[in-house]
């Protein structure tokens, strides 16, 4: 039961995280104009990964896409790539994890297969979360170090006198959405990996084999022989019959051909 809950919760947390990563990637407010110590606030610039916007204080807003690829900073391209990789990995992870969920039965899929799929999706979520966190952090670092600040010129006065003002940019809402979403995806992935350990059979059990005793018509059915060092006792008080131990989470299996004479 605990395994199912952990797996389900991991799936939901990852789902929310990936939705957040997608939202952050699409948002325009990755960097916003720092209005501190800037009294003439006629326009407010804010920029995303895909387009730049300007909001004029009387109410007009306009956005423009970055139509060039070659003219953009390499770091911006890297951030785009990281976010897209994160989304793709997360989406594949979600698809895999849906089939891995214990509460969903697909044909006669064994627990070992579900465990492997849970682990795979967990790893995908972890990498997806790390990609998002890395992308957002790289962008934040760019802002902090003024890596791709655009200089806005404010032309004032007569006779061509020019006053150049450096437009400073600060963290936009998308950065915080990205960090939280990446963290959630990472946590969800860890939970899936933990759930995988509970799904996988802990011990290898040999199937019981029925023997015909010579001279007797009685069939003997020994209990499941554990693969162990010989000193191990049944510490977990698991029932040992019908061909070996089963965990609580294990689905009921059909009798094997060896179970009866």
């Amino acid at each position: 039961m605990a395994v199912t809950a952990c797996q389900g919760l991991g799936f939901v947390v990852s789902l929310i995280g990936i939705a957040g990563i997608i939202a952050a990637t699409c948002m325009d407010q990755w960097s916003t104009q720092d209005l501190y110590n800037n009294p003439v606030t006629a326009v407010f610039n804010y920029q995303g990964l895909w387009r730049s916007c300007v909001r004029e204080s009387s109410g007009f807003t306009e956005c423009r896409g970055y139509f060039t690829l070659l003219g953009l900073p390499a770091m911006l391209q890297a951030v785009r790539a990281l976010m897209i990789v994160g989304i793709v990995l997360g989406a594949i992870g979600l698809l895999v994890s849906i089939f891995a969920l214990k509460c969903i039965r697909i044909g006669s899929m064994e627990d070992s297969a579900k465990a492997n799929m849970t682990l795979t999706s967990g790893i995908m979520f972890i990498v997806s979360g790390l990609c998002a966190i890395a992308g957002v952090s790289v962008f934040a670092n760019m802002l902090v170090t003024n890596f791709w600040m655009s200089t806005a010129n404010m032309y004032t006065g007569m006779g061509g006198m020019v006053q150049t003002v450096q437009t400073r940019y600060t963290f936009g809402a998308a950065l915080f959405v990205g960090w939280v979403a990446g963290g959630l995806t990472l946590i969800g992935g860890v939970m899936m990996c933990i759930a995988c350990r509970g799904l996988a059979p802990e011990e290898t059990n040999y199937k019981a084999v029925s023997y015909h005793a010579s001279g007797h018509s009685v069939a003997y059915k020994p209990g499941g022989f554990k693969a162990s060092t010989g000193f191990g006792s049944n510490t977990k008080n698991k029932k040992i019959y019908d061909g070996g131990a089963r965990t609580e989470d294990e689905v009921q299996s059909y009798p094997s051909k060896h179970d009866y004479v």
Epitope: N45, E56, S57
Partner: nanobody
Framework: QVKLEESGGGLVQAGGSLRLSCAAS?????????MGWYRQPAGNQRNNQRE???????????NYADSVKGRFTISRDNAKNTVSLQMNSLKPEDTALYYC???????????????WGQGTQVTVSS
């Protein structure tokens, strides 16, 4: 580089009219998106705080400040890159330094920028 040249300010009696004009020059390397007028009342000169009066975009959409609606009319000529502000029924509280402004996207720039004129004084006496 874009320069804005204003004209039309002056002294007028309350209830009177004035027309402010503004022409943009050197805009061949930039796309002017919004043009309009801001003002800076005498009390705000020190902290450089300017308030929007009226703005118009390239499609002809217009925004007016609530305080001037119904009294001021803005018009723009996109071909000539000029903007005019017809001010009617002027009140003493309209006294301010009026700035022409343009919001433009320089060619190849990632973000927009604002260009200001030098300002023209409008004084409304009671």
């Amino acid at each position: 580089q874009v320069k804005l040249e204003e004209s039309g300010g002056g002294l007028v009696q309350a209830g009177g009219s004035l027309r402010l004009s503004c022409a943009a020059s050197g805009s061949s390397n930039a796309d002017i998106r919004f043009m309009g007028w801001y003002r800076q009342p005498a009390g705000n000169q020190r902290n450089n705080q300017r308030e929007p009066v009226a703005m118009v975009d390239t499609t002809g959409r217009i925004n007016y400040a609530d305080s001037v609606k119904g009294r001021f009319t803005i018009s723009r000529d996109n071909a000539k890159n000029t903007v005019s502000l017809q001010m009617n029924s002027l009140k003493p509280e309209d006294t301010a330094l009026y700035y022409c402004t343009a919001v433009l996207w320089p060619r190849g720039a990632i973000s927009a920028m604002t260009v200001w004129g030098q300002g023209t004084q409008v004084t409304v006496s009671s």
